[in-house]
């Protein structure tokens, strides 16, 4: 055993940016530490052979499976991979290792399985086994969490059936409004299933895996804050589970709090109530509404209401699926080339959407914020005064929903020239879209005033480029004009450009460019 | 270089919760067939396998134990974390953590790497 | 759950002595049995795996054997390091049990 190499097996996990086949080389890529494979020699198997721990890989990922080798002298290797051979390029290391490694770009189904890599030393020979398999992500959900009372206890638990099993934390805030954002020192994480403390503002619980992030927001009225000028309104699917928490502070503890639906007080085991006393020795009381499982039924207005402070109420409402309402109308935007402008969706969803902001085939990340009046709204500035087509996309498992809006930027046209054989064409990209002249040059009109009246062709808007709309004009040429120079303007309401064209050149041949104001 | 670190209260009263974590480095749960378990050892008695996770987020537990613990994980934080409920005197112990490959061919080579331990003390 | 009876429970020897130490499981195995040794205060260290199988790095003079129920760990010639105790694991099934080990002493 002790005149064997010391092997150790490596994975590295590469940041996508490119795509190709497997290479047995180094290759330049935004790389994640190397992670122990946990090489050992396989037990009771004819030769020397290590094998790796198998390795699972999403679809398209990028990794390099290497083995550095503490062994002296020089080695040479082999890779073999469904009976093909890959070439090897064994280096040394600054601990003078050897260093292989077998590179996998952009991982498909043909990509995975055994990579055996054979490896000759002055001193032995021996493999080593790599096994890579993809993994099946399709089993994979992340469910939202919802809540549970903890049997015979003052406490909730947070519950997400996911897959995998996600990490469950309550996200605590005890100040109003922006404060209680996720970064914000005002929040505090506890990564638990069970909550005892729940008189916080602001109380949510959040489940992750490898799918993302989900959460659930503790739906609270609170009395002694201002009620909204409309009605909270909180959204549930058949069978989900409702929780409306009602919690106010006094003086002291000579008050009670009590819920109604639509007039009538909730039945025993609905709710449950706690109190503590806070710092300054006031009574905080919170009384929970609950139904484990809703039905049509359970929907209507529940009012909390209190010895010592205003009612107030809140809209539950029922549905059977999930929805997503919104005005899908396309929208047209045209702004200058300097002006601040953002996108804006205003929707009414419910379960929580997910949803992306998409131009020219490229997807950005998409906010979204909760208005007052239980409407969602969700911007996007990071159009950077490209004109075009953007497109925004929810869904919600229930619901899916897209609008479509058109960006224009008012500008100058900028003129883009080319000659053929038979005709000279130019074309322009400007907002508004521009119109066209088209100018003999001649000894005549040396400043190429002279109009071409005949054989102008006009497209407008021909050409959509994600949504970009490009007009072209082409001057179909007679045996008369040609080695003449022409001229072709594009003019909207912000200025004029020109190009100047010599007739009978046979490519692309603008020599003159004019810009003219 | 591949090591595991285990943490948490090096007291706990009694009928308390004991939450430990184990962080490790160097390998992870998200790309290779790994998994980590929890063993512990009362001063001068044997070792006592408690608890395991595979890299799907399979779990296995004592069978004298099971309805006290839970073991999870957080890939992205490479770290495991076992939780002990109701704890007594007799819960007493060293609690390691330690990995153990998986292999395609079926074999397992059982706990390669240990944490060093971390001592936790069950007193009123 | 499958019951792992290490013995003997402790065991005295001298420096350059031949040591053999046994595992018995309460039903078959295979080969999926591991041996470690500890020093008081320190994590266990793998010395065997699959019943047989030499951890990279330990000397030779530790050795594996056996398959089924009948598993042994031999120390063909003692060391002063080697005075430590030793485990054995079995791997097979879920719940994995270890033997309760071997307590080696300096005669």
């Known amino acids: 055993n002790q005149d064997l190499p010391v092997i150790k097996c490596v994975l590295i996990n590469h940041k996508n940016n490119d795509s190709s086949v497997g290479k047995s080389s180094s290759y330049p890529m935004v790389s994640e530490s190397p992670e122990d494979l946990g090489c050992a020699l396989r037990p009771q198997s004819a030769g020397t052979v290590y094998e790796a721990a198998t390795v699972e890989v999403d679809v398209s990922a990028s990794i390099t499976l290497q083995v550095l080798v503490d062994t002296p002298g020089n080695i040479s290797c082999l890779w073999v991979f469904k009976h093909s051979s890959l070439n090897c390029q064994p280096h040394f290391d600054v601990q003078n290792r050897g260093v292989v490694s077998m590179v996998i770009l952009k991982m498909t189904e043909t990509q995975a399985g055994e990579y055996l890599l054979f490896i000759q030393s002055e001193a032995t020979n021996y493999t080593i086994l790599f096994t890579v398999s993809i993994r099946n992500t399709l089993l994979f959900t992340l469910r939202r969490p919802y809540f549970r009372k903890m049997e015979n206890q003052d406490a909730l638990v947070c519950i997400s059936e996911s897959v995998p099993e996600p990490i469950v934390e309550w996200v605590l805030c005890d100040s109003q409004g922006e404060s209680c954002k996720e970064e914000s020192p005002a929040v505090v994480k506890k990564e638990e299933k069970v909550l005892h403390e729940l008189f916080g503002t602001d109380i949510r619980c959040c489940a992750r895996n490898e799918l993302g992030r989900e959460c659930t927001r503790l739906f609270t009225i609170d009395l002694n804050q201002t009620p909204q000028t409309t009605l909270p309104q909180l959204f549930l699917k058949v069978g989900e589970p409702l929780w409306i928490r009602c919690k106010a502070v006094h003086v002291n503890h000579g008050f009670g709090l009590t819920w109604e639906l639509e007039n009538k007080a909730l039945e025993e085991g609905s709710y449950f109530e706690m109190s503590t006393y806070s710092t300054n020795r006031t009574m905080i009381r919170i009384l929970f509404a609950f139904v484990s499982s809703v039905a049509r039924n359970d929907t209507g207005y529940y009012t909390c209401s209190s010895s010592k402070h205003p009612s107030q109420s809140a809209l539950v409402t029922i549905v059977e699926k999930g929805f997503i309402n919104a005005t899908n109308s396309s929208e047209d935007y045209e702004i200058d080339q300097y002006e601040e402008f953002c996108f804006s969706v205003r929707f009414k969803a419910y379960p929580q959407i997910r949803c992306t902001w998409t131009f020219s085939r490229k997807s950005f990340p998409c906010e979204q914020k909760g208005l007052d009046d239980g409407y969602s709204v969700s911007k996007f500035c990071n159009h950077k005064h490209q004109p075009g087509e953007y497109i925004f996309h929810a869904e919600n498992g229930d619901a899916q929903f897209t609008k479509m809006f058109t960006l224009n930027i008012r500008r100058k046209p900028q003129v883009l020239a080319e000659a053929s054989a038979s005709q000279a064409s130019c074309s322009s990209d400007g907002y508004p879209l521009p119109s066209w002249t088209w100018k003999k040059c001649s000894d005549k009109s040396p400043n190429c005033t002279e109009d071409i009246p005949e054989g102008v062709w006009n497209r407008k808007a021909n050409r959509k480029v994600f949504g970009q709309w490009v007009s072209s004009s082409t001057l179909n040429m007679s045996e008369a004009m040609k080695g003449f120079l022409v001229k072709c303007c594009a003019y909207n309401s912000l200025g004029t450009s020109c190009e100047t064209i010599l007739l009978n050149s046979p490519g692309p041949f603008p020599f003159i460019q004019d810009s003219i104001s | 270089q591949v090591t595991l670190k285990e943490s948490g209260p090096t007291l706990v009263k009694p009928t308390e919760t004991l939450t430990l974590t184990c962080t490790f480095s160097?390998?992870?749960?998200?790309?290779?067939?790994?998994?980590v378990s929890w063993i512990r050892q009362p001063p001068g008695k044997c070792l006592e396998w408690l608890a395991h996770?595979?890299?799907?987020?399979?779990?296995s537990y004592s069978t004298s134990l099971k309805s006290r613990l839970t073991i999870s994980k957080d890939t992205s934080k490479s770290q495991v974390v076992l939780t002990l409920t109701n704890m007594d005197p007799v819960d007493t112990a060293t609690y390691f953590c330690?990995?153990?490959?998986?292999?395609?061919?079926?074999?397992?080579?059982?706990?390669?790497?240990w944490g060093q331990g971390t001592m936790v003390t069950v007193s009123s | 759950d499958i019951q792992m009876t290490q013995s003997p429970s402790s065991l005295s020897a001298s420096v350059g002595d031949r040591v053999t130490i046994t595992c018995r499981a309460s039903?078959?195995?295979?080969?999926?049995l591991a041996w470690y040794q500890q020093k008081p205060g320190k994590a266990p260290k793998r010395l065997i795996y699959?019943?047989?199988s030499l951890q990279s790095g330990v000397p030779s003079r530790f050795s594996g054997s056996g398959s089924g129920t009948e598993f042994t760990l031999t120390i063909s010639s003692l060391q002063p390091e080697d005075f430590a105790t030793y485990y054995c694991?079995?791997?097979?099934?879920?719940?994995?049990?270890f033997g309760c080990g071997t307590k080696l002493e300096i005669k």
């Open positions: 039903q078959d195995i295979r080969n999926d």
């Open positions: 694991l079995q791997h097979n099934s879920y719940p994995l049990t």
């Open positions: 160097g390998f992870s749960l998200r790309y290779a067939r790994m998994g």
């Open positions: 699959a019943a047989s």
């Open positions: 996770i595979f890299s799907n987020d399979e779990k």
């Open positions: 330690a990995r153990m490959p998986e292999y395609s061919s079926g074999w397992s080579g059982a706990f390669d790497i």
